[in-house]
């Protein structure tokens, strides 16, 4: 259904990184433009990037007023130049997302190894807690605030000359691994999830080497 | 475990007033969009009315338009569907649902009888 | 108003049988659109929604497919306790509308 000049939105697609969060779709408009509304299972639809050309519109602000909650987001095709114009059934053409939970689907970003401290034989791996988009009283929460023991970091380990991998888990942001006296080692993090059934782990962090700036040595 | 249940119906006569009621729990009221369905005897469905988590946002299919008025009460975990200027037609079984997005019908309750009858 | 019309209005079947009942809308809905059961004086009982999506703690067997004017449900083997009548509906605008109804019967 529709006006003959406009054509439905399809692939709509989310895409989300520590909550900041997008969605896209096509096609390219061609004499049409495009509003997005946003809704939870309430069905109190909010309209965002009125009447645009783009093929993609920031929805970050609404989901993270609830990061739990289920959000689909319905795009609207309307004929540019006349944007009262409505379809057939006296609705402009839309096409709805797919269902959109923040908590459980939006992707875990890049963690970035902090810091490490190396005292004797054992080093100290400090993971940045990064901050997130959402909010509350008005501070911006980070990682570990939103997932609490939800979220675990992942590090992996290995003596800067060998191949042979080692690895440690954490409920913090920290690790403490027993390394060998005066030996390198070089070691990447990565973010999990483990409840998740889809986006359980973030890419690999950069990875660090002892004896870079990063790094602290005490005997 | 989703809960729906009506209450309200009976027998009114034509142009008689009643209000159904649909008593709600097991989940977060407030956060689903509600719906009225109703079912003439021996007939199919009927969508009648629907109405938005926050109750800002009503919809009503045409028969019903300025007779039937659709509202929620959040803090009681309560929809209503208040009926005026009944007619023979309205006469049916009225069923509560809950409706995700204010689009499909997701749980039902059991159904309330309405009689329009002089 | 957008119309929907199904077909068969009824239909005999046996247990383990393959069934198809076919919804066609007077317009094109995209996949918005739901399949419910019913059993003689009880409520409604959702099956399907968007189209081919499975509500939660239905079985397998039910399936749905389509997109645009056209859907089917399909319940793959037929169980005793699936036969009912059976309903779609359109939400892509508002008034929202239902088939007529299919009543699955047995054979």
């Known amino acids: 259904s529709g006006t003959t000049n406009t054509v439905a939105a399809y692939n709509l697609t989310w895409k989300s990184t520590n909550f900041k969060t997008i969605l896209e779709w096509e096609p390219k408009p061609v004499n049409q433009v495009y509003t997005v509304q946003i809704s939870t299972k309430s069905g109190d639809w909010k309209s965002k990037c009125f009447y645009t050309t783009d093929t993609e519109c920031d929805l970050t602000d609404e989901i993270v007023k609830d990061v739990k909650q289920t959000y689909l987001a319905r795009v609207f095709s309307y004929p540019a130049g006349n944007v009262e114009s409505t379809g057939s059934a006296g609705e402009p053409l839309y096409e709805n997302s797919p269902e959109f939970t923040p908590y459980l689907e939006t992707n875990l970003g890049q963690p970035t190894i902090q810091s490490f401290e190396q005292v004797g034989t054992k080093v100290n791996v400090t993971v940045e807690d990064e901050r997130t988009l959402v909010r509350r009283n008005n501070t911006f929460l980070s990682l570990r605030d939103v997932f609490g023991k939800d979220l675990i970091y992942t590090l992996y380990y290995w003596k800067d000359s060998s191949t042979g991998r080692k690895t440690n888990t954490t409920h913090t942001n920290e690790f403490l691994i027993d390394v060998e006296k005066g030996v390198s080692y070089c070691f990447f993090a990565q973010a999990v999830i483990p409840s998740r059934t889809v986006n359980r782990k973030s890419t690999d962090s950069p990875v660090e080497c002892m004896g870079q700036e990063k790094g602290e040595f005490r005997e | 475990e989703v809960q729906l249940l009506e209450s309200g119906g009976g027998l009114v006569q034509p142009g008689g007033s009643l209000r159904l009621s649909c008593a709600a729990s097991?989940?977060?009221?407030?956060?689903?969009?509600m719906s009225w369905v109703r079912q003439a005897p021996g007939k199919g469905l009927e969508w009648v009315s629907s109405i938005s988590g926050s109750g800002d946002y009503t919809y009503y299919t045409d028969s019903v338009k300025g007779r039937f008025t659709i509202s929620r009460d959040n803090s009681k975990n309560t929809l209503y569907l208040q009926m005026n200027s009944l007619r023979a037609e309205d006469t049916a079984v009225y069923y509560c649902?809950?409706?995700?997005?204010?689009?499909?019908?997701?749980?039902w309750g059991q159904g309330t009888l309405v009689t329009v009858s002089s | 108003d957008i119309q929907m019309t199904q077909s068969p209005p009824s239909l005999s079947a046996s247990a383990g049988d393959r069934v198809t009942i076919t919804c066609r809308a007077s317009?094109?809905?995209?996949?918005?659109l739901a399949w419910y059961q019913q059993k003689p004086e009880k409520a409604p009982k959702s099956l399907i929604y968007?189209?081919?999506s499975l509500q939660s703690g239905v079985p397998s067997r039910f399936s749905g497919s389509g997109s645009g004017t056209d859907f089917t449900l399909t319940i793959s083997s037929l169980q005793p306790e699936d036969f009912a009548t059976y309903y779609c509906q359109q939400y892509n605008s508002y008034p929202y509308t239902f088939g007529q109804g299919t009543k699955l019967e047995i054979k």
């Open positions: 317009q094109g809905i995209s996949s918005r």
């Open positions: 649902a809950r409706s995700p997005w204010g689009y499909y019908l997701d749980s």
């Open positions: 097991g989940f977060t009221f407030s956060n689903y969009a």
């Open positions: 968007a189209a081919s």
